[in-house]
């Protein structure tokens, strides 16, 4: 069995989580991919997913989550913009491959969002960014409802951080329309 590891990202409110999930492009280029949150004792919950089949470099936005799947590179980019403290939790990138269970990409992400002025408009990119605009044309894809039953029976992965996931529902999934995110200059 693959050992599940976690990568801790500590960011401030208003910043952007920017994760690159690599995959074998020959196998998974056009497969549908998703961003999920994992709460203790629950099955992973899909927050956003790419279209099926996944479109090359075409941004999909659900609330404050933006997915971009780069087929040519074997890379799924996940961004959560304007982070809030309640976004803290455990996340993962997965590839849907029905009828098989989803294939997990990358390390799981332990996101810790703290209050306080970030100093940058919304990035964890060390201020090297000089242009950052959310694309005006984004689509929202319909995500499959199933999740892997096996994931539930796994022991929760050990974390280097003692961070609890908030009990309150994250608003990211309660969005029915595409939300326009303010442009950062």
């Amino acid at each position: 069995a693959t050992k599940l590891t976690e990568e801790k990202y500590e960011l401030k409110e208003g910043q952007t989580l920017d994760v690159k999930c690599d995959y074998t492009l020959e196998k998974f280029a056009s497969s549908q991919k998703a961003w999920q949150i994992i709460r203790d004792g629950e099955m992973p919950k899909t927050l956003a997913c790419t279209e099926r089949p996944s479109k090359n470099s075409h941004p999909v936005q659900v609330g404050r989550i933006i997915l971009e799947d780069y087929h040519d590179h074997g890379l799924l980019r996940v961004r959560m913009v304007n982070l809030q403290v309640e976004d803290s939790g455990l996340y993962q990138c997965v590839i849907y491959q029905p009828p098989k269970e989803p294939h997990m990409l990358f390390d799981r992400i332990r996101l810790v969002v703290t209050k306080g002025f970030s100093g940058t408009p919304g990035s964890n990119e060390n201020s090297t960014q000089n242009v950052y605009k959310i694309p005006p044309t984004t689509t929202k894809a319909l995500c499959p409802l199933y999740t892997s039953p096996r994931t539930v029976t796994q022991a929760p992965p050990k974390s280097t951080a003692d961070v609890s996931t908030p009990d309150s529902e994250i608003n990211l999934t309660n969005v029915t329309d595409i939300i326009r995110v303010p442009v950062f200059n």
Epitope: E7, K8, K20, D22, Y23, N56, S57, Y70, D72, H73, G74, L75, F106, D107, N124, E125, N126, T128, Q129, N130, V131, Y132, K133, I134, P135
Partner: antibody, heavy 116, light 107 residues
Framework: EVQLVESGGGLVQPGGSLRLSCAAS????????MSWVRQAPGKGLDWVAS????????YYVDAVKGRFTISRDNAKNSLHLQMNSLRAEDTAVYYC?????????WGQGTLVTVSS | EIVMTQSPATLSVSPGERATLSCRAS??????LAWYQQKPGQAPRLLIY???IRATGIPARFSGSGSGTEFTLTISSLQSEDFAVYYC?????????FGGGTKVEIK
């Protein structure tokens, strides 16, 4: 077959300017991030700048920020690097590369020499 | 800025032998690590991405491993065409940074 062909390199005096260009073919240019990576003679690789497909995101290494400008013309499948206020330490082979984070395809490079 | 450190600077290996190259990051880069090969007078070529995924057309003798801060590129049985300089690169955060390179030379 992916092809990236750089041009515009040459000898320039400190404080001068050069504009590098890259002609891309063999892939969907408008769907790809593009970057410039440089290599000083006998040295290692250094990332210079990256630009998203629609230029909505652009990143530079600190050493060139404010002096270099990366741009692209998707209609012409071309990538550019405008280099101003050049310094001796900018002397290098400049590679046009496909990708914004890691680099799948590389051109053969164009040599920029900054010397008086 | 994430600093990438490669070791050794030079590795002398006989053809057919195994070569193990190391790359260390000053802070965690998760699995966002790539390896490149560069031969004299040529542009670099992507070998490995995602720390362990072989790029298209790369022979199976090349393998990558590691996560976080410690990474390894292994060439299981060196062929004559494998003698070159190898670079690691992190792409977790901008600025993107490369290691200083490891030269694999014929013993």
């Amino acid at each position: 077959e992916v092809q990236l062909v750089e041009s515009g390199g040459g000898l320039v005096q400190p404080g001068g300017s050069l504009r590098l260009s890259c002609a891309a073919s063999g892939f969907t240019f408008s769907s790809n991030w593009m970057s410039w990576v440089r290599q000083a003679p006998g040295k290692g690789l250094d990332w210079v700048a990256s630009i998203k497909q629609d230029a909505s995101e652009i990143y530079y290494v600190d050493a060139v920020k404010g002096r270099f400008t990366i741009s692209r013309d998707n209609a012409k499948n071309s990538l550019h690097l405008q280099m101003n206020s050049l310094r001796a330490e900018d002397t290098a082979v400049y590679y046009c590369v496909r990708g914004g984070w890691r680099f799948e395809s590389w051109g053969q490079g164009t040599l920029v020499t900054v010397s008086s | 800025e994430i600093v990438m450190t490669q070791s050794p600077a030079t590795l002398s290996v006989s053809p057919g032998e195994r070569a193990t190259l190391s790359c260390r990051a000053s802070q965690s880069v998760s699995s966002n690590l790539a390896w490149y090969q560069q031969k004299p007078g040529q542009a670099p070529r992507l070998l490995i991405y995602g720390a362990s995924i072989r790029a298209t057309g790369i022979p199976a003798r090349f393998s990558g491993s590691g996560s976080g801060t410690e990474f390894t590129l292994t060439i299981s049985s060196l062929q004559s065409e494998d003698f070159a300089v190898y670079y690691c690169q992190q792409y977790k955060n901008f600025p993107l940074t490369f290691g200083g390179g490891t030269k694999v030379e014929i013993k």
